[in-house]
Interface confidence: medium
């Protein structure tokens, strides 16, 4: 659902912070948050600032990739004296504020996680009005997205000398181990990882020479689960057919 205001309880500001006269800017974020693909994750971020009881206009921002220059994935703004932080940007509608900037809390909730969300995120707050000031986390919080294996492509392709090879590509985190089984491979699982392994959570295994007709099965496995898919090779007078 979409919030039109900011949450008032998840994150109260604090503190002793306000009783110390020379409070400096600081941001507190954990080094890493882990969650499974498809689930939601909370990226915590709280801050302190030197402007005692600031109630002027503020903007809360989250970036991805790198601080200061990375693309924004979330932004909201609150008017003077208001607790309502109106969302101006929520990438794909999946980012929403969990914290309350008026409580010095910028914690963000990310819905429906995908492997592509596995990157570093940086929170930032901007004050405008009587006070003009801003601060951004320098190191950010790394969102580590885990996922059970999923085979994204399996195919049979022609290779020189009227032979055939099979390719299996899977994604997952941790990167899955791939194995081929099929005719004449016996009980031994043949797996050859391509140089692209690990690139964007994708792993590819090639079976370079299919010497017998029949069913070839690719199995992908990691600590979160396993997945398998098959192709069938039939050769008729030099032609081939494959189905998944």
């Amino acid at each position: 659902f979409v919030r039109t205001k900011i949450d008032t309880t998840e994150n109260l500001l604090n503190t002793e912070v306000h009783s110390s006269p020379a409070q400096r800017w600081s941001m507190q974020v954990p080094p890493e948050v882990s969650a499974e693909a498809g689930d939601a994750a909370v990226l915590p971020c709280t801050f302190t600032h030197p402007h005692r009881h600031y109630d002027g206009p503020l903007t809360a921002i989250w970036r991805a990739g790198e601080p200061y220059a990375g693309p924004q994935v979330f932004r909201c703004a609150a008017a003077r004296g208001s607790e309502l932080c109106q969302t101006a940007l929520s990438l794909h509608g999946r980012f929403r504020l969990l914290g309350n900037p008026r409580r010095n809390d910028l914690s963000l909730r990310v819905e429906r996680l995908a492997l592509a969300d596995d990157r570093r995120y940086f929170c930032r707050v901007e004050f405008a009005g009587d006070v003009h000031d801003r601060y951004e986390s320098r190191h950010g919080v790394r969102l580590h997205v885990t996922a059970a294996p999923r085979i994204v492509n399996i195919s049979v392709l022609p290779s020189p000398a009227h032979a055939f090879r099979a390719l299996c590509t899977a994604e997952g985190e941790p990167p899955p181990a791939l194995a081929w089984s099929g005719p004449a491979l016996g009980n031994s699982l043949a797996a050859v990882r391509s140089p692209r392994e690990g690139h964007g959570h994708l792993v590819t295994a090639e079976l370079p020479a299919l010497t017998h007709d029949g069913r070839y099965t690719c199995t992908a496995a990691n600590s979160l689960g396993r997945s398998e898919a098959s192709v069938y090779l039939f050769r008729f007078h030099g032609a081939s057919g494959a189905s998944t």
């Epitope: 205001k5 949450d7 309880t9 109260l12 604090n14 915590p44 004296g81 809390d105």
Partner: antibody, heavy 116, light 108 residues
Framework: QVQLVESGGGLVQPGGSLRLSCAAS????????MHWVRQAPGKGLEWVSY????????YYADSVKGRFTISRDNSKNTLYLQMNSLRAEDTAVYYC?????????WGQGTLVTVSS | DIELTQPPSVSVAPGQTARISCSGD??????VHWYQQKPGQAPVLVIY???NRPSGIPERFSGSNSGNTATLTISGTQAEDEADYYC???????????FGGGTKLTVL
């Protein structure tokens, strides 16, 4: 499922101390702000204290400031409230509550009685 | 500090609509949350952020916040809704959370 279980309540004399604990389970404790709320017998709810997800930010109601200290141990999924210089008016059921969109989950409470 | 004022009691016949008010300064610029508390039990969040229902809370519970008054509305009130109800908000100036005094809802 989310569960919060308070402990540590009991009878204490005025001026005494008590430490309450709140054991959390069923959610990522280290990602959420937490609160203590109390309710005197036959009275309404009174917010007591707040602590941010990491423990770096805390805040207190005026009625307990300087006497109570909120803390947390994220490695143990536990929230604490150290109560010193207790007064008769601190007598109440003390609840820990998770902070998100209101206090969305509450423990069942622990009774603190301050009496001589 | 902000003060939230609730009527001490509200009565309603079964099946009718109960409305519990909560008044305070500048409420439209604040979130208001509502809790139900039955005797001997911990409070339960029934409305958050003015008008959102947590999962598991019946649809007959709704909330609004306009002017300087927030309202909890219970449509088709049932006997099991008899309880104390508290509104709550956050005061960004005193940096504290504030509860209303509570309203006892009686289902006649």
């Amino acid at each position: 499922q989310v569960q919060l279980v308070e402990s540590g309540g009991g009878l204490v004399q005025p001026g005494g101390s008590l430490r309450l604990s709140c054991a959390a389970s069923g959610f990522t404790f280290s990602s959420y702000a937490m609160h203590w709320v109390r309710q005197a017998p036959g009275k309404g709810l009174e917010w007591v204290s707040y602590i941010s997800y990491s423990g770096s930010n805390t805040y207190y109601a005026d009625s307990v400031k300087g006497r109570f200290t909120i803390s947390r141990d994220n490695s143990k999924n536990t929230l604490y409230l150290q109560m010193n210089s207790l007064r008769a008016e601190d007598t109440a059921v003390y609840y820990c509550a998770r902070g998100w969109g209101g206090f969305d989950y509450w423990g069942q409470g622990t009774l603190v009685t301050v009496s001589s | 500090d902000i003060e939230l004022t609730q009527p001490p009691s509200v009565s309603v016949a079964p099946g009718q609509t109960a409305r519990i008010s909560c008044s305070g300064d500048n409420l439209p610029n604040r979130y208001v949350h509502w809790y139900q508390q039955k005797p001997g039990q911990a409070p339960v969040l029934v409305i958050y952020d003015d008008n959102n229902r947590p999962s598991g809370i019946p649809e007959r519970f709704s909330g609004s916040n306009s002017g300087n008054t927030a309202t909890l509305t219970i449509s088709g009130t049932q006997a099991e809704d008899e309880a104390d109800y508290y509104c709550q908000t956050y005061d960004m100036f005193s940096m504290s959370d504030v509860f209303g005094g509570g309203t006892k809802l009686t289902v006649l």
